[in-house]
Interface confidence: low
């Protein structure tokens, strides 16, 4: 199921608003963490500080761990470095759409989306295009709401991410995440 159409309202972990709020917090934290590891001061990333609850902190730690693993995947880094940032909107949505084009949803692909967004943001920082940062975050959250929200609701909310990556084989899953993103970037390069 995709995220199209009307979604139930309310404050529970599977409500549209709660999933989007948590997603925004996770994405913001993930991007800030990646930028911090580059050692760069990024006032553009000084977005609204929102206190995270214990569950969101666990999720953030999980994402950080996966991000570290993906950072060490040289093939993936090489492909991301080759991304043409002259048309970031088109690149983002082609890659994002391709990641989910077969209709199969899993947490690995959701994380891959976050990771790709973070890399585009870091490129924007490096190339001194700070106004792109919020925009890229927005594209990611727009995509999340409009394509992935229904599926995340079906998983019981973001906590499903912890059980997916909470297994002893999470490194294997991370390799799969890198594969998904590499494949999408390859297709984009061919189409582009």
């Amino acid at each position: 199921m995709d995220g199209s159409g009307e979604q139930p309202r309310g404050g529970g972990p599977t409500s549209s608003e709660q999933i989007m709020k948590t997603g925004a917090l996770l994405l913001q934290g993930f991007i800030q963490d990646r930028a911090g590891r580059m050692g760069g001061e990024a006032p553009e990333l000084a977005l609204d500080p929102v206190p995270q609850d214990a569950s969101t902190k666990k999720l953030s730690e999980c994402l950080k761990r996966i991000g570290d693993e993906l950072d060490s995947n040289m093939e993936l880094q090489r492909m991301i470095a080759a991304v043409d940032t002259d048309s970031p909107r088109e690149v983002f949505f082609r890659v994002a759409a391709d990641m989910f084009s077969d209709g199969n949803f899993n947490w690995g692909r959701v994380v891959a989306l976050f990771y790709f967004a973070s890399k585009l943001v870091l490129k924007a920082l490096c190339t001194k295009v700070p106004e792109l940062i919020r925009t890229i975050m927005g594209w990611t959250l727009d995509f999340l709401r409009e394509r992935l929200l229904g599926w995340i609701q079906d998983q019981g909310g973001w906590d499903g991410l912890l059980s997916y990556f909470g297994t002893p084989t999470w490194q294997t899953v991370t390799i799969f995440v890198a594969g998904v993103l590499t494949a999408s970037l390859t297709i984009w390069k061919k189409m582009g």
Partner: antibody, heavy 119, light 109 residues
Framework: EVQLVESGGGLVQPGGSLRLSCAAS????????MHWVRQAPGKGLEWVAS????????SYADSVKGRFTISADTSKNTAYLQMNSLRAEDTAVYYC????????????WGQGTLVTVSS | DIQMTQSPSSLSASVGDRVTITCRAS??????VAWYQQKPGKAPKLLIY???SLYSGVPSRFSGSRSGTDFTLTISSLQPEDFATYYC???????????FGQGTKVEIK
């Protein structure tokens, strides 16, 4: 150069139908959220509907839900607004617009097309 | 739905004046607010996005700021071509519909 050109407006009786078109050029509609915004005579701006072609997502204002349908033909780079069961209060200039993403606002607007619902 | 309460609804000012228009969001919208200028018979034009970023080609006398859920559009020195109606708009990412303020008409004193 980015351009949005609306067409299809006109005079229609209450209960009637109209289909508005928005021909986009200078960008790929497949990767943009397209919106219809209307403005009744002498009034403010009211968001009507949006479509994101890359993930087949549509959304509507409560005032038009069930009566209006937004769609897009990416091969023609054109967005549409099918308006059924029209009411007098739907009388307005209808603008087609491109939304630039979170916080980015609407960066390009068409010139607008007038829809008049009257008997 | 998130409401955007814009004030004043109209104001009279002279060329060279500093003009301030305010919008208050009914709940947090982070910085996802844009400002537009509209002249009679014309489509709106984007001035400010993400609360405080000046859109390409817009004169630097226009600026936007945010304090919590209050958003301000400032014209530092009003020019003859600035007499128009101004609208704020929110596009917070987990809130459809997009909503506009009621508009502020800036008239010549």
């Amino acid at each position: 150069e980015v351009q949005l050109v609306e067409s299809g407006g006109g005079l229609v009786q209450p209960g009637g139908s109209l289909r508005l078109s928005c021909a986009a050029s200078g960008f790929n509609l497949s990767y943009s959220s397209m919106h219809w915004v209307r403005q009744a005579p002498g009034k403010g701006l009211e968001w009507v509907a949006s479509i994101s072609s890359y993930y087949s997502y549509t959304s509507y204002a409560d005032s038009v839900k069930g009566r209006f349908t937004i769609s897009a033909d990416t091969s023609k780079n054109t967005a549409y607004l099918q308006m059924n069961s029209l009411r007098a209060e739907d009388t307005a200039v209808y603008y087609c617009a491109r939304y630039y993403g979170y916080g980015g606002g609407i960066d390009y607007w068409g010139q607008g097309t007038l829809v008049t619902v009257s008997s | 739905d998130i409401q955007m309460t814009q004030s004043p609804s109209s104001l009279s000012a002279s060329v060279g004046d500093r003009v301030t228009i305010t919008c208050r969001a009914s709940q947090s919208v982070s910085s996802a607010v844009a400002w537009y200028q509209q002249k009679p018979g014309k489509a709106p034009k984007l001035l400010i996005y993400s609360a405080s970023s000046l859109y390409s080609g817009v004169p630097s006398r226009f600026s936007g700021s945010r304090s919590g859920t209050d958003f301000t559009l400032t014209i530092s020195s009003l020019q003859p071509e600035d007499f128009a109606t101004y609208y704020c708009q929110q596009s917070w990412y987990y809130s459809y519909p997009i909503t506009f303020g009621q508009g502020t008409k800036v008239e010549i004193k």
